[in-house]
């Protein structure tokens, strides 16, 4: 009775269960009643990451420097190359096929989370008592200057974009 289903790491062909090729190898010849499956290692620039019956290996991903990409992890015969973005850039999508510059947080906003190769800058509005007067991908909101600790008084109130202006206390003559 020919099988209708095969065990794990096997496949059905010509009413027979053949071993799949291990990761890193592709199928060259199916097994027969008398011979094992014949597999061949993928070449240097190729990979297969599962037990398979593929007759061709997949090409490693190319990290295109023109798209701002660089190799984070070199591919092997069993794994694809992992790309990441150059300094100052992050992936446009989860598959990281191209990169875009990190966004800057505008005045009135500070950096909540610095961008990485895979995620953009996260900005947050400066709360009361804090300000940011620059457009930056790194700077957090800074606290207003404390005039009191300098024995000064507030001459001009701070905003989310500007620091307070301190001045000398009015001396009574």
């Amino acid at each position: 009775e020919p099988p209708t289903a095969c065990r794990e790491k096997q496949y059905l062909i010509n009413s027979q269960c053949c071993s799949l090729c291990q990761p890193g190898q592709k199928l060259v010849s199916d097994c027969t009643e008398f011979t094992e499956t014949e597999c061949l290692p993928c070449s240097e620039s190729e990979f297969l990451d599962t037990w398979n019956r593929e007759t061709r290996c997949h090409q490693h991903k190319y990290c295109d420097p023109n798209l701002g990409l660089r190799v984070q992890q070199k591919g092997t015969s069993e794994t694809d190359t992992i790309c990441t973005c150059e300094e100052g850039l992050h992936c446009m999508s989860e598959s990281c096929e191209s990169c875009v510059p990190h966004r800057s947080c505008l005045p009135g906003f500070g950096v909540k989370q610095i961008a990485t190769g895979v995620s953009d800058t996260i900005c947050e509005p400066c709360p009361v008592g804090f300000f940011s007067n620059v457009s930056s991908a790194f700077e957090k909101c800074r606290p207003w200057t404390s005039c009191e600790t300098k024995d000064l008084v507030v001459q001009q109130a701070g905003t989310n974009k500007t620091d307070v202006v301190c001045g000398p206390q009015d001396r009574q003559r």
Epitope: S29, D30, T32, E36, E38, E44
Partner: antibody, heavy 119, light 106 residues
């Protein structure tokens, strides 16, 4: 018994191409890939590549891409390898080989084809 | 590419002498295979999967090793063992061979 019968020696001029053959007998030809191996005068063995006799897909050693082209004729149980733009560096014995019924090793070899490139 | 370095390149041994040929791989491989070749003939499978003798190979031959270091040993050299021996890896593409060890009878 399993036999891989290769074509005879070739004396060719530089710049031309040569096509050598390997006929399989004593087994089902499409059950095994055919590999090609070069043995230069220094006696060094180099794997050129392999071709699936069933699927027809060829796998090349990067070094021989553009130099060697492997093909198969299932009807005559014969594998072919064409070597292009020959130079003296291509003068060598070329073997076809096949693995055994089990395991990844070359159990059967052809008798070799001597290719001599000379003006 | 995985480079296979054989040593020695050439050696001579007297009948009855123990012979060891080594093969070092530039990166780890699962198994090593060995071929014997005599002048004017095709290579012959001699040892497969590191330590298994091919059909008809005398039991004075043995193979061992793992990772990057492998060897072929003849416990007691005989005249018919004079030949060139090649190690071979089928682990990574391109498949590669060692440069060979020519064993001569002293």
């Amino acid at each position: 018994q399993v036999q891989l019968q290769q074509s005879g020696a070739e004396l060719v001029r530089p710049g031309v191409s040569v096509k050598i053959s390997c006929k399989g007998s004593g087994y089902t030809f499409t059950d095994h890939a055919i590999h090609w191996v070069k043995q230069s005068h220094a006696r060094r063995l180099e794997w050129i590549g392999a071709i699936s006799t069933n699927y027809g897909a060829a796998t090349y050693n990067q070094k021989f891409k553009g130099k060697a082209t492997m093909t198969v004729d299932k009807s005559s149980s014969t594998a072919y390898m064409e070597l292009a733009r020959l130079t003296s560096e291509d003068s060598a014995i070329y073997y076809c080989a096949r693995r055994g019924s089990h395991g990844d090793w070359f159990a059967y070899w052809g008798q070799g084809t001597l290719v001599t490139v000379s003006a | 590419d995985i480079e296979l370095t054989q040593s020695p390149a050439i050696m001579s041994a007297s009948p009855g002498e123990k012979v060891t040929i080594t093969c070092s791989a530039s990166s780890s491989v699962s198994y090593m295979h060995w071929f014997q070749q005599k002048p004017g003939t095709s290579p012959k499978l001699w040892i497969y999967s590191t330590s298994n003798l091919a059909s008809g190979v005398p039991v004075r031959f043995s193979g061992s090793g793992s990772g990057t270091s492998y060897s072929l040993t003849i416990s007691s050299m005989e005249a018919e063992d004079a030949a060139t021996y090649y190690c071979h890896q089928y682990h990574r593409s391109p498949l590669t061979f060692g440069a060979g060890t020519k064993l001569e009878l002293k």
